[in-house]
Interface confidence: medium
């Protein structure tokens, strides 16, 4: 038997992926475990093999279909179970009634690019990936810029309270290397959380013209 406290957390990417993390204090390291998804109103079910991500936590992705297919709706409830093999049997270790649109975490924004750069400002655009059409414009973004000599954690957060897939960064220093990241969150869902940060976009401001004030 497996003792200890268990935590089972899953998020839906709004299209065709449910990502789950199961942590269990005192779990057996050599036990084979999986997540089983049983939707209450769909004629399919899905499993994924839990793989270790740390000493006491495992993760897996339930791939429900093609990346941009709308596999679940706001009314779906998916029974998610962690099943671990005990001899010839599977034992239910954790269970939750998962409401996909209450537990959203979108994919990180993609295709970041510099639209226009000057000495003191830079206009950057991006795209959202695999986001449901249900959201329409009900999304918000956070962005951060990494300045020389600082860490990402020190970077101030810029909040965009609407679906705006671009930003104009102001008051930058000329001829300086920066990095930029953005993340997205739907306004819907009691347990919805921010997407992962995008891959950083590196850019350099233009040098100031000689003889001009900076």
């Amino acid at each position: 038997a497996v003792n200890g406290t268990s935590q089972f957390t899953c998020f839906y990417n709004s299209r065709a992926n449910i990502s789950c993390v199961w942590s269990q204090d005192g779990a057996l390291q050599d036990t084979s475990c999986q997540v089983h998804a049983w939707p209450d109103r769909r004629r399919w079910n899905q499993t994924c093999e839990l793989l270790p991500v740390s000493q006491a936590s495992w993760a897996c992705n339930l791939i429900l279909g093609a990346p941009d297919s709308q596999k679940l709706t706001t009314v779906d409830i998916v029974t998610l179970r962690v099943l671990c093999r005990e001899g010839v049997r599977w034992r239910v270790m954790a269970i939750q009634d998962f409401k996909p649109f209450e537990n959203l975490r979108l994919m990180a924004p993609i295709s970041l690019q510099v639209v226009h750069v000057e000495t003191h400002r830079c206009n950057i655009s991006w795209e959202i990936s695999q986001a449901s059409h249900y959201f329409e414009r009900h999304l918000e973004f956070e962005a951060r810029t990494l300045s020389p000599g600082h860490t990402w954690e020190e970077a101030p957060l810029l909040t965009l309270k609407q679906k705006q897939e671009w930003i104009c960064l102001e008051t930058l220093t000329p001829d300086t290397q920066y990095e930029f990241q953005v993340r997205v969150k739907p306004l819907q869902g009691e347990f919805t959380t921010w997407s992962p940060w995008s891959q950083p976009l590196a850019f350099r401001t233009k040098p100031a013209a000689l003889g001009k004030d900076t």
């Epitope: 209450d40 109103r41 709706t73 029974t79 269970i95 939750q96 009634d97």
Partner: antibody
């Protein structure tokens, strides 16, 4: 064979409480969601709420806070606890289960139990 | 909440007649069901997911529609079809039913 059997109905005074039971057989309540639906005399059907296979509940806002759905897995039985009852809660109360998927609609119904709220 | 409006609220037809009931939703729904309720009995599922016949249901019953407009048809009314018929949506919570259509024999 899937069967649902409600009990616990009767006459209750306004402001009183009542607990209805729904005994399930032919399936496990930990594998299917079960719903409560009522029908006032001569009126239509009103969905009250559900308890899902994992044990979480969902309610119609019209009764949320007054009605509570629970279950006893060992008895394979569902409950509807009704508090602060009003005359307009007078109805036949049904428990119902969908087919293998909710996609299939309410394929299984109990026979209903009558609740009368009157002084 | 999604309002489901059935019409007519009652109808009287002869044995063998074709009977049609409509159900209008206040917004688009994607999962629609039809139930039959005989006097003093629990409802019985007839049609699931708009047009699929539930197990054991005679083929004279059928359903169609999409979006906000749905239709239920009895191709040849039989004496045992005397009942009230309800539509129900399962596209959003709370689940809602139509107010019912009472079918009688002339």
């Amino acid at each position: 064979e899937v069967q649902l059997l409600e009990s616990g109905g009767g006459l209750v005074q306004p402001g009183g409480s009542l607990r209805l039971s729904c005994a399930a057989s032919g399936f496990s309540v930990t594998s299917y969601g079960v719903h409560w639906i009522r029908q006032a005399p001569g009126k239509g059907l009103e969905w009250l709420g559900a308890i899902w296979s994992g044990g979480s509940t969902q309610y119609n806002a019209a009764v949320k806070g007054r009605f509570t759905i629970s279950r006893d897995n060992s008895k394979n039985t569902l409950y509807l606890q009704m508090n602060s009852l009003r005359a307009e809660d007078t109805a036949v109360y049904y428990c119902a289960r969908a087919g293998d998927y909710n996609y299939d609609g309410f394929a299984y119904w109990g026979q209903g139990t009558l609740v009368t709220v009157s002084s | 909440d999604i309002q489901m409006t059935q019409s007519p609220s009652s109808l009287s037809a002869s044995v063998g007649d074709r009977v049609t009931i409509t159900c209008q939703a206040s917004q688009s729904v994607s999962f629609l069901y039809w139930y039959q309720q005989r006097p003093g009995k629990a409802p019985r599922l007839l049609i699931y997911d708009t047009s699929n016949l539930a197990s054991g249901v005679p083929s004279r019953f059928s359903g169609s529609g999409s979006g906000t407009s749905y239709t239920f048809t009895i191709s040849s009314l039989q004496p045992e079809d005397i009942a009230t018929y309800y539509c129900q949506q399962w596209s959003t919570y709370p689940l809602t039913f139509g107010q019912g259509t009472k079918v009688e024999i002339k």
